[in-house]
C-alpha cells in the first residue's frame, strides 16, 4: 500500500470488529429454555463473515436416541440440497448437493454438525438440521447471512467537498460525518448482492478544517478523516 504523502490522505483508522467467531452454535442458554419437547423448532438468523469457516449445529440429542439426521440446505437459485445419515445402516446419502465446501464436520455418527469451509456470498441461505427420533422430530434452522467487508475510501474531490465510499459491502454500510455537512448519499447494488454506498458532503462554514467519515458495518466500523484544503483530492483506500 502507498504511504501517505500529503494531508488529504488517510490520517487515522479505528477498527471495531463485531464478529470474531465463525461457529454458528448458539449459546445454549438462549435456546434451551423453551425447547424441551419433541417437535420443537428453533430458527436463528446468523451473520457470518465471508472467507471464514462456519460450523452449524444440530439440537443436543444423543445419537442413541436418533433414527436419521438430515441437513437441508436451501441456497438462492439452487435446488434444495439434503445430506442424510441413517443410524441403523450407518450410511450417508446426498441429494442435489454440489458445493464441496459444505460438508459434515466429521463422520455423522461422531458429530452431526455441518461445516462451511471458506464462506462465500453464494452460501447465503437457509440451513436446517432435522433429527428424527422415535417420538417425533427436532429441528434447528439457520438463516445464514454472509457478510462482506466493504472497502472504504475517503477523498476530497473539489473545494470543501469530500467523498466517502464504502465499496461492495454486504449488507450496505452506513456512512455518517463529523461534523455534519450538506450531504447526499447514493447506493449502488451489484448482482452478487453487495452494495456500494457513496456519501458526498460539502461544508460551507470555513472554520471546519477537519472532517471525519464514520463507516458502520456488521463486520466492523472504520473512521477516516481528512483536512479540507483547497487542492484537488488525492485518494486513499482501506479495508475495514
Amino acid at each position: 500500500a502507498a504511504q501517505p504523502n500529503n494531508s488529504l490522505m488517510l490520517q487515522t483508522s479505528k477498527e471495531n470488529h463485531a464478529l470474531a467467531s465463525s461457529s454458528l452454535c448458539m449459546d445454549e442458554k438462549q435456546i434451551t429454555q423453551n425447547y424441551s419437547k419433541v417437535l420443537a423448532e428453533v430458527n436463528t438468523s446468523w451473520p457470518v463473515k465471508m472467507a471464514t469457516n462456519a460450523v452449524l449445529c444440530c439440537p443436543p440429542i444423543a445419537l442413541r436416541n436418533l433414527i436419521i439426521i438430515t441437513w437441508e440446505i436451501i441456497l438462492r437459485g439452487q435446488p434444495s440440497c439434503t445430506k442424510a445419515y441413517k443410524k441403523e445402516t450407518n450410511e450417508t446419502k446426498e441429494t442435489n448437493c454440489t458445493d464441496e465446501r459444505i460438508t459434515w464436520v466429521s463422520r455423522p455418527d461422531q458429530n452431526s454438525d455441518l461445516q462451511i469451509r471458506t464462506v462465500a456470498i453464494t452460501h447465503d441461505g437457509y440451513y436446517r438440521c432435522i433429527m428424527v427420533t422415535p417420538d417425533g422430530n427436532f429441528h434447528r434452522g439457520y438463516h445464514l447471512q454472509v457478510l462482506v467487508t466493504p472497502e472504504v475510501t475517503l477523498f476530497q474531490n473539489r473545494n470543501r467537498t469530500a467523498v466517502c465510499k464504502a465499496v461492495a459491502g454486504k449488507p450496505a454500510a452506513h456512512i455518517s460525518w463529523i461534523p455534519e455537512g450538506d450531504c447526499a448519499t447514493k447506493q449502488e447494488y451489484w448482482s452478487n448482492g453487495t452494495v456500494t454506498v457513496k456519501s458526498t458532503c460539502h461544508w460551507e462554514v470555513h472554520n471546519v478544517s477537519t472532517v471525519t467519515c464514520h463507516v458502520s458495518h456488521l463486520t466492523g466500523n472504520k473512521s477516516l478523516y481528512i483536512e479540507l484544503l483547497p487542492v484537488p483530492g488525492a485518494k486513499k483506500s482501506a479495508k475495514l
Epitope: 445454549e28 434451551t32 419437547k37 460450523v55 444440530c58 443436543p60 440429542i61 445419537l63 417420538d135 427436532f138
Partner: antibody, heavy 119, light 110 residues
Amino acid sequence: QVQLVQSGAEVKKPGASVKVSCKASGYTFTSYVMHWVRQAPGQGLEWMGYINPYNDDTNYNEKFKGRVTMTRDTSTSTVYMELSSLRSEDTAVYYCAREDYYGSRWGYWGQGTLVTVSS
Amino acid sequence: DIVLTQSPASLAVSPGQRATITCRASKSVSTSGYSYMHWYQQKPGQPPKLLIYLASNLESGVPARFSGSGSGTDFTLTINPVEANDTANYYCQHSSELLTFGQGTKVEIK
C-alpha cells in the same frame, strides 16, 4: 403421567443371578432409552448401561460387561436388568431412569430396588 | 472414560447463605455449543431428581434458587439462598455415549 415402577427387593446368594424389572407407563415405551444405575449403601451413583426399546440396542459399562444383560418386553412395556455371578459388593439399590431426548437428561426415575447379596 | 471430580465432598451451610459445588471433568464435555453436564439432587431413601441440564438450564418445577454454570471442564452448581429442605446429596453427571457421575457432595444445613 410418566411412571417407572420397579420390582421388589431381592436377597440373593453369592454366585446367583438377579433380574430386576422396570415397568413404564404414561408414554410410548419404545420411544425412549432406559438406563440402569446402581448405588451401594452410603456410596454414589454408578451407571451400568442402557437399552433402547425402539431397536433393542444396548450399551454396557465396561465394568459390568459379561455379567449384565438388559432386555425389554414391548407387550408389557417393561425393561429388565439381569446381573449374574453376584458377589457381596453387588449389594445396592438398582434404579432405572428414562432419558429425555433434549440434552440427554434423565427426567424420570424408578423408585429403586434393593438387591442384597449375602451368604 | 471421562472422570468427574466433585468438591467439596461435604458442605455445611446456614439457611439463607449460598452453597457452591464444583465438578471438574477430566476432559471437555462441551461439544457443538452445548455442555453435556447435568446436576441431580438425592435425598435419603429417594431416587435422584434432575435439577439442572446442559450445564445451566433449570429443569421444570425446580426452584430458581438452584443455578448452574460452566463449560468445557469446569462446572458449578449454586444454591442461593439455601433452605432447610436442601439437605441432600448432589451429583454431577456427564451424558455422552458412556455416562459418568461425580462422587457426590453432601450438603447439610446448619
